[in-house]
């Protein structure tokens, strides 16, 4: 779980090792700050969980293209 | 393919606990999410618990909370069900399930494991 | 925690016509940011493990046939075998995956008629 040191920054410390479909998430954001260990993604869920996952992992990538899209593309 | 296959049939006396396996094979542990769901005779689909994801551990039907634990072991790829102080009522068939990405549904289950509680 | 609630408990239907069990969540499992009702129905034969049917409410999995349909938003779903088949006979259920814990509904019982 991310982890707020000072806020605003949050950091992660872990990454989750398990697959998550997308169709779980809602939203994420990167955590690039210089303050933090290494860089993250959180994702938020549909029951609001967070979750810290390594950018580096290409269902983490995918998962964030996903969402990308998801918010471009316009409900009808 | 995920492919899950299960410990045999154990007989148990009430108070006694029972630790039940599930091997995992096609995929490793750490890709899954695994959870066990249980039957009792004539009876419906009962979810215990199992690893979430979202909450970065195991958790546990309230029901079964104090009662139930639940381990892997990633060097095998098994994880394990352990359900103390039985009673009649834990007489049931017992099922691990997964899916490869965790959306809380279950494509692979495990042929079941019959736990028999008697005195 | 969701309250699943199916209906019938059982349900005799001759060869070839449509059986219909619904399933009524207690909350919804509609997710509108993706439009997706997070309710799944599962098949339980006999001496077997449940078997995945239809998931985000109305997509068959590969390999079930198109006698099998889901329909329903919300907190109503409808499982329907439009021409029921001697293979059909069998335990449904269905389950919400919204939230945990995990929830089934009591299950529904299909004889043929």
């Known amino acids: 779980q991310p982890d707020a040191i000072n806020a605003p920054v949050t950091c992660c410390y872990n990454f989750t090792n398990r697959k998550i479909s997308v169709q779980r998430l809602a939203s994420y954001r990167r955590i690039t700050s210089s303050k933090c260990p290494k860089e993250a993604v959180i994702f938020k869920t549909i029951v609001a969980k967070e979750i810290c996952a390594d950018p580096k992992q290409k269902w983490v990538q995918d998962s964030m293209d996903h969402l990308d899209k998801q918010t471009q593309t316009p409900k009808t | 393919q995920v492919q899950l296959v299960q410990s045999g049939a154990e007989v148990k006396k009430p108070g006694a606990s029972v630790k039940v396996s599930c091997k995992v094979s096609?995929?490793?542990?750490?890709?899954?999410?695994m959870h066990w769901v249980r039957q009792a005779p004539g009876k419906g689909l009962e979810w215990m618990g199992g690893?979430?994801?979202?909450?970065?551990?195991?958790i546990y039907a309230q029901k079964f909370q104090g009662r139930v634990t639940m381990t892997e072991d990633t060097s095998t790829d098994t994880v394990y069900m352990e359900l103390s102080s039985l009673r009649s009522e834990d007489t049931a068939m017992y099922y691990c399930?997964?899916?490869?990405?965790?959306?809380?549904?279950?494509?692979?289950w495990g042929q079941g494991t019959l736990v028999t509680v008697s005195s | 925690d969701i309250v699943m609630t199916q209906s019938p408990d059982s349900l005799a239907v001759s060869l070839g016509e449509r059986a219909t069990i619904n399933c009524k969540s207690s909350q919804s499992v509609l997710y509108s940011s993706n439009n997706k009702n997070y309710l799944v129905w599962y098949q339980q034969k006999p001496g077997q493990p449940p078997k995945l049917l239809i998931y985000w409410a109305s997509i068959r999995e590969s390999g079930v046939p198109d006698r099998f349909s889901g329909s329903g938003s919300g907190t109503d779903f409808t499982l329907t075998i439009s021409s029921l088949q001697a293979e059909d006979v069998a335990v449904y259920y269905c389950?919400?995956?919204?939230?945990?814990?995990?929830?089934f509904g009591g299950g529904t019982k299909v004889e043929i008629k």
């Open positions: 690893f979430d994801p979202e909450d970065g551990e195991t």
């Open positions: 096609g995929y490793t542990l750490t890709e899954l999410s």
């Open positions: 389950q919400q995956y919204y939230s945990t814990p995990l929830t």
């Open positions: 399930a997964t899916r490869e990405f965790w959306t809380g549904y279950f494509d692979h």
